[in-house]
């Protein structure tokens, strides 16, 4: 059993307004645009803004108030911001979709320290590991090091998308006061999806004496 | 490179018509809706024409230009255009052509093309 | 006339922070998203802020853009003298279909 709550002020169950529902989707596939109503009999038009109207014909794209507008082969074309129309006693109300194709490319992994890393004892240990991917990719960074269990480092992480071509991801790792247990092999690890990329770097302590 | 470039402006006196054309490249020009927007001398920017990315009855004019203007385009040539018919000292203005973002907003324009109507 | 409102100039000093503001209707910014333009003299306007608050990749984090029913704000801050341009807010209109402009602000860095 599917309910109808009627609300002439709110025809659809959800309402993205002001920041717009991010639906990812994958070419070729089955893409829902959630927009469903509050009463079966609401007119609905979908958009692609701020030209197009995407009309249901049956077959490829499909209009279903209990779930919205079902798009059974999802193309490029259906890339950008997708908007719900209904108007209701005069007002025209609008509910507004994102969607994005997302890919798990990973171009380049860098830890940007010599290699090996030579450093005194009591010293801070900074390394920063840097991730380049295209735009609509997002990262997972991650590292592990000698001292994991304790807990030993902080972690900064910030995104660079100044660049027009491509995102740069930072994980900037930490360690104050370094002691011998510090030593030995530090690696970052880049996640995207599916794929994967690491980088190392080996430390080595070194005591006043032996510099 | 993603880039859109403007011809056909010139000097015409009151009355006149004018077509200006946009060549677009670095980009699936059929994808994508476009516009026309002008700026008068030391004036602001006014919308003038947007098309749909298939050119077919979506095109959308503002007021002032109805009747007169019109908006097209040749996907085969990824090429914009826009007729300018009866035209007056008040649409003295450069014009740009511009795409459309995949997101909202105008993310390529033109240089422009300068339209000059004066007797 | 224009359709979204604007003042017609700013200033401010480097380092300063500055806001410019837009505002409009239900038809435009009440039920659309807003975009932000900046036109240096002499050459064509670029796409600042779009989906009311989202910057364009290379678009340096010192620009944001919100909004609030009808109105709308771009605030740059750690102003360089670079920045020195005309910033014009933009919607899409229901009532007009088509874009709507603000007049445009043309920000001054002292």
């Known amino acids: 059993i599917y309910i109808f709550i009627s609300d002439t002020g709110r025809p659809f169950v959800e309402m993205y307004s002001e920041i717009p529902e991010i639906i990812h989707m994958t070419e070729g596939r089955e893409l829902v645009i959630p927009c469903r109503v509050t009463s079966p009999n609401i007119t609905v038009t979908l958009k692609k803004f701020p030209l197009d109207t995407l009309i249901p014909d049956g077959k490829r794209i499909i209009w279903d108030s209990r779930k919205g507008f079902i798009i059974s082969n999802a193309t490029y074309k259906e890339i950008g911001l997708l908007t719900c129309e209904a108007t209701v006693n005069g007002h025209l109300y609008k509910t507004n979709y994102l969607t994005h194709r997302q890919t798990n490319t990973i171009i380049d992994v860098q830890i940007s320290t010599p290699r090996p890393v030579k450093l005194l004892r009591g010293h801070t240990l900074v390394l920063n590991c840097t991730a380049t991917t295209p735009l609509n990719t997002r990262v997972q960074m991650t590292w592990s090091y000698p001292d994991e269990k304790n807990k030993r480092a902080s972690v900064r992480r910030r995104i660079d998308q100044s660049n027009s071509h491509a995102n740069i991801f930072y994980s900037v790792l930490t360690i104050d006061k370094m002691q011998n247990k510090d030593k030995g092999l530090y690696t970052c690890r880049v996640r995207s999806g599916p794929s994967f990329k690491s980088v190392n770097t080996s430390v080595h302590i070194y005591d006043k004496a032996f510099i | 490179e993603v880039q859109l470039l403007e011809s056909g402006g010139g000097s015409v006196q009151p009355g006149g018509s004018l077509r200006l054309s946009c060549t677009a490249s670095g980009f699936n020009f059929e994808d994508y809706g476009m516009n026309w927007v002008r700026q008068a001398p030391g004036k602001g920017l006014d919308w003038v024409s947007s098309i749909n990315r298939n050119g077919d009855i979506s095109t959308y004019h503002v007021d002032s230009v109805k009747g007169r203007f019109t908006i097209s385009r040749d996907n085969s040539k990824n090429t914009l255009y826009l007729q300018m018919n009866s035209l007056r000292a008040e649409d003295t203005a450069i014009y740009y052509c511009?795409?459309?973002?995949?997101?909202?907003?105008?993310?390529?324009w033109g240089q422009g093309t300068t339209v000059t109507v004066s007797s | 006339q224009s359709v979204l409102t604007q003042p017609p100039s700013a200033s401010g000093t480097p380092g300063q922070r500055v806001t410019i503001s837009c505002s409009g209707s239900?038809?435009?910014?009440?039920?659309?998203?807003v975009n932000w333009y900046q036109q240096i003299p002499g050459t064509a306007p670029k796409l600042l802020i779009y989906l009311n608050s989202q910057r364009p990749s290379g678009v340096p984090d010192r620009f944001s853009g919100s909004k609030s029913g009808t109105s709308a704000s771009l605030a740059i801050s750690g102003l360089q003298s670079d920045d020195e341009a005309d910033y014009y807010c933009?919607?899409?209109?229901?009532?007009?279909?088509?874009?709507?402009f603000g007049g445009g602000t043309k920000l001054t860095v002292l």
């Open positions: 933009a919607s899409w209109d229901d009532s007009l279909n088509g874009w709507v």
């Open positions: 239900r038809s435009n910014i009440g039920n659309n998203f």
């Open positions: 511009t795409k459309n973002h995949d997101y909202h907003g105008m993310d390529v």
